[in-house]
């Protein structure tokens, strides 16, 4: 999972916060000498060696290709850039740079279906053929359709009532007019 490659390289968050609070903002406690505060590395760089004494420079190096740091830090190595997942139909919105991670997203007329905070699938928005759009497709939500008379909602698409089998939920939505119009997007089908 991104971010990756930093486990064990820096103190745990609780320890880090305690130690950081001993120094003014933008500085951190020297890894071997608690009485020295060193300047943190700028975003886009990582820590090579602590400052030898107060007022002397911390040695930082720019992140190599394929890695980044997005904020001031004292990481011993940069974080690995995220790769947009083609198998989830993701596209690259902006490439990884030394100071910012890759931004992945979806093509136009697609929404994001989340698996975890860092993993999502891009899914085509329902076009609502044979119906009208009740709620448009949003970043993380498919279109909500309202089907025309003679159609019912299944798999987020308006399907002809001739496809409705007896005893199915769609029977209610496929009654003869004037009730044919009354379709509820929450009654049947797939999101």
């Amino acid at each position: 999972i991104h971010p990756s490659g930093v486990t064990g390289l820096v103190p745990s968050l609780g320890d880090r916060e305690k130690r950081d609070s001993l120094c003014p903002q933008g500085k951190y406690v020297h890894s071997k000498n608690n009485s020295i505060c060193c300047t943190k590395c700028h975003k886009g760089t990582y820590l090579v060696s602590d400052c030898p004494s107060p007022g002397r420079d911390t040695v930082c190096r720019e992140c190599e290709k394929g890695t980044f740091t997005a904020s001031q830090n004292y990481l011993r190595q940069c974080l690995s850039c995220k790769t947009c997942r083609k198998e989830m139909s993701q596209v690259e919105i902006s490439p990884c740079q030394a100071d910012k991670d890759t931004v992945c997203g979806c093509k136009e007329n697609q929404f994001q279906r989340y698996l975890s905070e860092t993993h999502f699938q891009c899914v085509d928005c329902s076009p609502c053929f044979n119906g009208t759009v009740t709620i448009p497709c949003k970043e993380t939500q498919n279109t909500v359709c309202n089907c025309h008379a003679g159609f019912f909602l299944r798999e987020s698409e308006c399907v002809p009532c001739s496809h409705c089998k007896k005893n199915e939920e769609c029977m209610k939505l496929c009654l003869p007019p004037p009730l044919a119009n009354v379709t509820n997007p929450q009654d049947s089908g797939t999101a």
Epitope: E87, S89, Q112, R113, Y114, L115, S116, E117, F120, Q121, V123, D124, T134, I135, K138, T140, Q141, N142, V144, R154, E155, S156, P185, Q186, S188, G189, T190, A191
Partner: antibody, heavy 115, light 113 residues
Framework: EVQLVESGGGLVQTGKSLELSCEAS????????MNWVRQAPGKGLEWVAY????????YYGDAVKGRFTISRDNAKNLLFLQMNNLKSEDTAMYYC????????WGQGTLVTVSL | DIVMSQSPSSLAVSAGEKVTIGCKSS????????????LNWYQQKPGQSPKLLIF???TRHIGVPDRFMGSGSGTDFTLTINSVQNEDLADYYC?????????FGAGTKLEIK
């Protein structure tokens, strides 16, 4: 850390109602589709209900359709299951599960429907 | 409704052996739009909640050991556990999310000899 915590289960008589809640934390709740799944004692898993991230799409299992209502409050990171006209066969452990792929699960809350 | 038939209902193997669990659906789970099979596999250890192992029939979820492998397409799917470990003692379920109502298989109880 992702957490889903179900509550509201307990012993209830046939024909009565009960509302289950699921509190989510550690992830962006409003981005995720959510589900309720149940498991009768010693039995397998049964899907109960689904709600999309923005509540625009809602679906139910055949066994609960017309009796159960799924809803969510994205501002409070809460998922609900309103269960009416309970039957003895609704006795089960009820789990809330997050993501379209059921990637996150709570520990469950036990609902016992007595005659 | 799509019916999911899982087999066997139980099996007992020794640690280190290979395990194969089958799942058949009453209709194809292959989505023609994205060419993905909407079939997931879950593991439920005794007294615990289920855990996602595999989605899209063959994609391992984050953190799942690579001894767990999913395969198959259309209506026939397989979960393979290569070199079973003692901690793999659990019930295993397949689930179709191709269409509503979603349906689980009846489960396979894996016991370690």
């Amino acid at each position: 850390e992702v957490q889903l915590v179900e509550s509201g289960g307990g012993l209830v008589q046939t024909g009565k109602s009960l509302e289950l809640s699921c509190e989510a934390s550690g992830f962006t709740f409003s981005n995720y589709d959510m589900n309720w799944v149940r498991q009768a004692p010693g039995k397998g898993l049964e899907w109960v209900a689904y709600i999309s991230s923005g509540s625009g799409h809602i679906y139910y299992g055949d066994a609960v359709k017309g009796r159960f209502t799924i809803s969510r409050d994205n501002a409070k990171n809460l998922l609900f299951l309103q269960m009416n006209n309970l039957k003895s066969e609704d006795t089960a452990m009820y789990y809330c599960s997050g993501s379209y792929w059921f990637a996150y699960w709570g520990q469950g809350t036990l609902v016992t429907v007595s005659l | 409704d799509i019916v999911m038939s899982q087999s066997p209902s139980s099996l007992a193997v020794s640690a280190g052996e290979k395990v194969t669990i089958g799942c058949k659906s009453s209709q194809s789970l292959l989505n023609n739009k994205d060419q993905k099979n909407y079939l997931n596999w879950y593991q439920q250890k005794p007294g615990q909640s289920p855990k996602l192992l595999i989605f899209f029939a063959s994609t391992r979820h984050i953190g799942v050991p690579d001894r767990f492998m999913g395969s198959g397409s259309g209506t026939d799917f397989t979960l393979t556990i290569n070199s079973v470990q003692n901690e793999d003692l659990a019930d295993y379920y397949c689930l179709q999310t191709y269409s509503f109502p979603y349906t689980f298989g009846a489960g396979t109880k894996l016991e370690i000899k």
